[in-house]
């Protein structure tokens, strides 16, 4: 048999070998596709199937607009002028080229030695699904699960049957000062079909610098609270990626899960003390915030105690 590849929506003509070009003809077309459950023999006189597969006067079979459901096998059996039976057998596959792939949500820059999301490559409207590949400086990027991580998702449209592919690339650049170029390409995996490429994105890789500053914000301002009240301590840090944050009270680590927010509900005198947060960055040592004092008072009208946070409610480490 012969393998035929047809573009979705385009017409396809399959010739019936051996069939006389004009009637009278002795021929039979049958098909086994997504529209049938077994073999369907087409009537030479035409009928309801003509909208999807029609026998032409010369004996060929016309598919006016091929669809996904037309994938399958088409066979013609004809008797030629000399009375010999000739068979034609076609295996039809269909395809649809998607729109040009795009890199959405691209990074503005990358930081060396830490995981960075480069962006998400999106291709819409393909059939069959095809594949997305990432390229670095023109060379194919092979995901290794460590320095190069690719997260893929394939969705099929419930009505059209066409595919949308998404591929998210995360990399750990080894050193700063470079300007790598990333691009993404879509391939259907069909012969003679060139891949579709995105516009490349060039990103600067910077060395991971120390966090610009660590701030400890306290609510209520001043750190003075009545018994039974709630205190919220927030450790604000500008580093990327966000570091792990641990908490210290009166010089001792608090046995809590890492979190940038510490909530003290229904405070009592046992919650009084000096609090600070410690941010641990992957490429740097731990960094501690200035301390804040928490005071629990009945009236709440006393001024800030010595060593407590000032009016702004923040302690800042330059």
């Amino acid at each position: 048999g012969q393998n035929i590849t047809a573009r979705i929506g385009e017409p396809l003509v399959l010739s019936c070998k051996g069939a006389p070009k004009k009637p009278p003809q002795q021929l039979e077309w049958k098909l086994n596709t997504g529209r049938t459950e077994a073999w369907k023999v087409l009537s030479p006189q035409g009928g309801p199937w003509d909208s999807v597969a029609r026998i032409l006067p010369n004996g060929s079979l016309l598919l006016p607009a091929t669809g996904i459901v037309d994938e399958g096998t088409f066979r013609c059996r004809a008797t030629n002028r000399r009375g010999k039976e000739v068979k034609s057998n076609y295996r039809v596959r269909v395809y649809q080229i998607p729109g040009k792939p795009e890199i959405v949500d691209p990074a503005s820059e990358l930081t060396a030695s830490v995981p960075n999301k480069v962006g998400t490559c999106v291709s819409e409207g393909s059939y069959p699904a095809g594949t997305l590949s990432w390229h670095l400086d023109g060379k194919l990027l092979i995901p290794d699960g460590k320095e190069t991580l690719v997260k893929e998702e394939t969705r099929r449209h419930p009505e059209t049957g066409l595919f949308t592919l998404r591929s998210e690339l995360t990399v750990i650049p080894t050193q700063g000062g470079t300007h790598p170029t990333f691009s993404c390409s879509f391939s259907l995996g069909l012969p003679r079909r060139r891949p579709l490429n995105t516009a490349p994105i060039q990103l600067r890789v910077r060395e991971p610098g120390p966090p610009e500053g660590i701030q400890l914000l306290v609510e209520p301002e001043g750190g003075i609270v009545a018994p039974g009240g709630t205190v919220t301590l927030t450790c604000a840090i500008s580093a990327q990626p966000p570091p792990q944050v641990h908490w210290i009270k009166d010089g001792a680590p608090l046995p809590l899960a890492p979190s940038p927010v510490l909530l003290l509900p229904e405070v009592g005198h046992e919650d009084e003390g000096t609090y600070s947060c410690v941010a641990t960055h992957p490429s740097h040592g731990p960094q501690e915030s200035p301390p804040v004092s928490i005071r629990v008072t009945e009236t709440g009208d006393e001024g800030p105690a010595e060593g407590s946070v000032g009016e702004s409610g923040l302690g800042t480490l330059a």
Partner: antibody, heavy 119, light 107 residues
């Protein structure tokens, strides 16, 4: 809203002619096959004719072949049935319906127009 | 030509009853069968397309099934507005062929 409205029915003598029309609206007319179906008084439904979306191919049962002609004007969103050599047994309500091929069957029908063949 | 033998030709039923109507094709017609409802003086209304699919706006008490060349329309709980005549149609081959109809009457 998808709508089909038939017109042109009436009383005609045996051997006479009549032309039915069907005005379509609410859908892209030239994307669909169209079909005429009839129903004799107190009887069941009978297929009369179908035409493909371009108008190039027409289909009839033996009972009306060579007497009836289905046609369409895609620019006017209109379907027609030219009926010649009418017989008493052609008396029926004639319905225009969208479809007629395997992608659809028949999905939307007009309200029908009555054709009476009698002397 | 394909024959569509519809049974029964009529039936009497009460509101709330489960009603089953069958069409048997004289040869394989695949899934290419529609079911219609027709009320007196009105045009047919499509209920089921391609043997088993419920048409838009049709109540879910209507369903279609197929076993080989046997096609069934089921009304799970008959409602007062369901008293009408029902037809099947095969559209796999020309001539397009309708079943003879089933009149559903109030018992």
């Amino acid at each position: 809203e998808v709508q089909l409205v038939e017109s042109g029915g009436g009383l005609v003598q045996p051997g006479g002619s009549l032309r039915l029309s069907c005005a379509a609206s609410g859908f892209t007319f030239n994307n669909y096959w169209m079909t005429w179906v009839r129903q004799a008084p107190g009887k069941g439904l009978e297929w009369v004719a179908s035409i493909d979306n371009s108008g190039d191919n027409t289909y009839y049962p033996d009972s009306v072949k060579d007497r009836f002609t289905i046609s369409r004007d895609n620019a006017k969103n209109s379907l027609y049935l030219q009926m010649n050599s009418l017989r008493a047994e052609d008396t029926a309500v004639y319905y225009c319906a969208r479809g007629g091929d395997i992608t659809l069957g028949l999905d939307v029908w007009g309200q029908g127009t009555l054709v009476t063949v009698s002397s | 030509d394909i024959q569509m033998t519809q049974s029964p030709s009529s039936l009497s039923a009460s509101v709330g009853d489960r009603v089953t109507i069958t069409c048997r094709a004289s040869q394989d017609v695949g899934i290419y069968v529609n079911w219609f409802q027709q009320k007196p003086g009105k045009a047919p209304r499509r209920l089921i397309y391609r043997a088993t699919n419920l048409a838009d706006g049709v109540p879910s008490r209507f369903s279609g099934s197929r076993s080989g060349t046997d096609f069934t329309l089921t009304i799970s709980s008959l409602q007062p507005e369901d008293f009408a005549t029902y037809y099947c149609l095969e559209f796999d081959e020309h001539p397009l062929t309708f079943g003879g109809g089933t009149k559903v009457e109030i018992k």
